[in-house]
């Protein structure tokens, strides 16, 4: 076309899809009349007439445009619609009087692609393969035009790189006309890349400038063969028996190679493999001394069938032997003295100590413990406790009983009871002494005894309240080879008086009814009266 | 006939580098562990390199470690030694060796070998 | 590291006659689990690759003529030529391969 050369540039319009662009005839008065104007798009350098404007009055041309034009801005404005892709084009309009001028105007169209899909390799990269593998796809939809992709690593681009680094990147065309972005990203990793996080990002553009989009990070799976094996116990620090141990066995290769963990037996030299778990790893519960030893792991890369043994690791569980008493059983006369010393092993240093039974009031610290001058009450339970001060709860106990010679040594001189007629009565005596003494009564009646401890006996009589009873009262007798000791029990008829609330002498009162021949509570509560003298 | 035919010795200035490469024929290269074995002059067996059947796992002694890659072509029955930063002491000849289908680790067949000599 | 001795460096023995190399390792190679040795013996004669002879410490390799026995377990293990012949002349290596993989120094087998 003659003069075509001599033609300004189009104005430029930029429209989003979707949106309506207003498309702005810039016909100045004297080169057209703007109530007399034929639009035309330009597709290919074919013109197509789309729409006419005769006295102000626009009219759509039959075709592609014909539903989505209108005027605006008296006339001088031509909207379209619901722009596309395939709207991206020039349009110009062309004025009729008073000469015929035009007037071009190239629209640009712009869309966002959706967030990018970043899509690993899940079968994952040998690091010494040959030429760079696929490491993940990204993939940028519904954009336009095409959107430029970067891909990175550890928040560093990627730039394509001779055997390292390949950016394979191809689009496809929807029937909407906006592009699918498909970028392959293809690199020789190295074993440091294990934690690498890649992802892609997506440079646009629209109206409003220039915008990007980023995926989400990911790793890929690196594997590489384990070059070194090694032994974790927990829990770290200083083990005890009873505790769970847990050998673990680890490797630095991907995937993990198969595993086996021995222990060393001393006498053979020879490595006994161990029963793991499926995950590879000992539990020793509760953990022994015997458990104690050098284990180590061996691991199996079945691709190369090479072999690998990590360093061995001392394993010491800490231990405190049974408890050793001498004399075990011992027996004294009083006055006497007594000396107890206690023993025991421990794969640490013990720290001793010897308690009162009856009180745990901490008698000595140290393996030995002297008594003088032995008194009765001297007789009962002594605990000495072996302990590992440096590692809390690991100690063993043993108890030893004194035992005091002596005749017997009732519980109570005097006893009064409560009792109804009748009623069946459940009486007990309690005496102690060594030898153990044995315990008769003076009454018939069903009797049993138990024995409390070695040096401890207490008898129940059951007997049947008569008046002789509660005339004579009943005695029990405690005998052994060195003398013998007596206990009375004063019964006493129940009266209303008696059962004031606020009396206080009916705390030996059966709680069961008087019927005749009833049993009453056979561990009924009994008041010891006063007893200046002394007991036994 | 299981072949295997080293090639790639020769004399070389230390700290320089040189190719090895075997040949394999005779059975399906692509489905066995290969690796390279030496031996100095007048000294004891020295393993070099292992390689798994796909090339993805490879192993070095800690002599030949980070100076010494092994690899493979599958689709050319190939196996390489590259070894760069050679010293004296890797003076030797090399034997490419091929394991058998056992549980354990074994050189089943080993080729004739080929002599490398660092010396300046 | 293993380390693996042999003993002697070198053996002369008549045709015939009985060859005994003993071959030690810093460390058992028994597998306690499958009760297996990870041990190897290998024959190099002059001028010649080696050759696969044994392996798991006494399982002959196909084509390995019965003459040829292993035997030991743990750290100690020996190879045997029951009668010695002209074409055992050979070092004779052990190798383990327990963890990596490390041969010992040879034994020289020669006919008085």
């Known amino acids: 076309v003659p003069g075509e050369a001599e033609q300004p540039a189009p104005e430029l319009v930029e429209v989003e899809v979707g949106s309506t662009a207003l498309l702005k005839c810039g016909l100045s008065q004297s080169q057209g009349n703007l109530s007399h104007v034929d639009w035309f798009s330009v597709h290919k350098e074919k013109r197509t007439l789309i729409f006419r404007v005769r006295q102000g009055q626009g009219q759509s041309e039959p075709g592609e445009y014909e539903q989505r034009l209108s005027l605006q801005d008296r006339g001088a404005t031509l909207a379209l619609t619901q722009v596309t892709p395939q709207d991206e084009r020039i349009f110009l309009c062309q004025g009729k009087r008073p000469r015929s001028q035009e007037y071009r105007i190239q629209l640009r169209v712009y869309k966002a692609p959706e967030e990018p899909n970043i899509q690993v390799n899940p079968l994952g990269i040998p690091v010494n393969s040959k030429e760079p593998e696929e490491v993940a796809t990204c993939v940028g939809r519904n954009g336009y035009p095409i959107p430029q992709v970067i891909w990175y690593k550890n928040g560093r681009p990627l730039k394509e790189e001779k055997n390292r680094v390949h950016i394979q990147s191809s689009q496809t065309v929807e029937s909407s006309g906006l592009y699918t972005l498909q970028s392959i990203l293809k690199a020789q990793l190295v074993k440091e890349d294990k934690d690498a996080q890649f992802y892609c990002e997506l440079n646009y553009r629209l109206p409003s400038g220039n915008h990007m989009k980023e995926s989400r990070e990911v790793t890929v799976p690196v594997f590489y063969p384990t070059e070194k094996v090694w032994l974790e116990v927990e829990p770290v620090g200083m083990l005890k028996e009873g505790d769970r141990v847990e050998i673990r066995c680890l490797a630095d290769g991907n995937p993990p190679p198969h595993f086996s963990i021995s222990k060393g037996n001393p006498s053979t030299r020879e490595a006994e493999e161990e029963t793991t778990n499926d995950n590879g790893v000992l539990v020793l519960e509760p953990a022994r001394k015997e458990h104690s030893g050098r284990y180590e792991c061996q691991a199996w890369n079945l691709d190369t069938m090479i072999s690998l043994l990590s360093e061995p690791q001392e394993l010491l569980v800490n231990y405190v032997s049974d408890v050793r008493v001498s004399p075990a059983a011992p027996e004294r006369q009083e006055g006497s003295s007594l000396t107890l010393t206690c023993e025991a092993e421990s794969s640490q240093d013990l720290e001793f100590q010897w308690l009162r039974e009856e009180t745990d009031q901490v008698l000595e610290r140290g393996p030995v413990l002297q008594l003088h001058d032995l008194k009765r009450e001297a007789g009962g339970g002594y605990r000495c406790v072996a302990s590992v001060p440096s590692i809390p709860g690991l100690n063993r106990t043993q108890l030893v009983k004194l035992a005091i010679f002596g005749p017997p040594w009732m519980a109570f001189k005097e006893r009064k009871v409560w009792v109804k007629e009748n009623m069946v009565l459940n009486l007990s005596c309690e005496a102690s002494g060594h030898p153990r003494p044995t315990i008769s009564w003076n009454v018939n009646g069903t009797a049993s005894e138990g024995d409390q401890d070695p040096q401890r006996v207490l008898s129940t009589l059951n007997v049947l309240v008569t008046p002789e009873l509660l005339e004579t009262g009943v005695e029990c007798t405690a005998s052994n080879d060195l003398g013998k000791n007596t206990s009375i029990l004063f019964l006493e008829l129940v009266n209303l008086t008696t059962l004031t609330p606020d009396s206080n002498t009916t705390t030996g009162l059966s709680t069961s009814t008087a019927s005749p021949h009833t049993r009453a509570n056979s561990t009924s509560t009994e008041r010891k009266l006063p007893e200046p003298e002394s007991r036994g | 006939e299981v072949q295997l035919v080293e090639s790639g010795g020769g004399l070389v200035q230390p700290g320089g580098s040189l190719r090895l490469s075997c040949a394999a024929s005779g059975f399906t290269f692509s489905s066995y562990i290969m690796s390279w074995v030496r031996q100095a002059p007048g000294k004891r067996l020295e393993w070099v390199a292992t390689i798994s059947s796909g090339g993805s796992s490879t192993y070095y002694p800690d002599s030949v470690k980070g100076r010494f890659t092994i690899s493979r072509d599958n689709a050319k029955n190939s196996l390489y030694l590259q070894m760069n930063s050679l010293r004296a002491e890797d003076t030797a000849v090399y034997y490419c060796?091929?394991?058998?289908?056992?549980?354990?680790?074994?050189?089943?067949?080993w080729g004739q070998g080929t002599m490398v000599t660092v010396s300046s | 590291d293993i380390v693996m001795t042999q003993s002697p460096d070198s053996l002369a023995v008549s045709l015939g006659e009985r060859a005994t190399i003993n071959c030690k390792s810093s460390?058992?190679?028994?597998?306690?689990?499958?009760?297996?040795?990870?041990l190897a013996w290998y024959q190099q004669k002059p001028g010649q690759p080696p050759k696969l002879l044994i392996y798991w410490a006494s399982t002959r390799e196909s084509g390995v003529p019965d003459r040829f026995t292993g035997s030991g377990s743990g750290t100690d293990f020996t190879l045997t030529i029951s009668s010695l012949q002209a074409e055992d002349v050979a070092v004779y290596y052990c190798k383990q391969s327990y963890n990596l993989l490390t041969f010992g120094q040879g034994t020289k087998v020669e006919i008085k």
């Open positions: 460390r058992s190679l028994l597998n306690s689990r499958i009760r297996k040795n990870y």
């Open positions: 060796t091929r394991d058998d289908d056992y549980d354990v680790k074994v050189f089943a067949y």
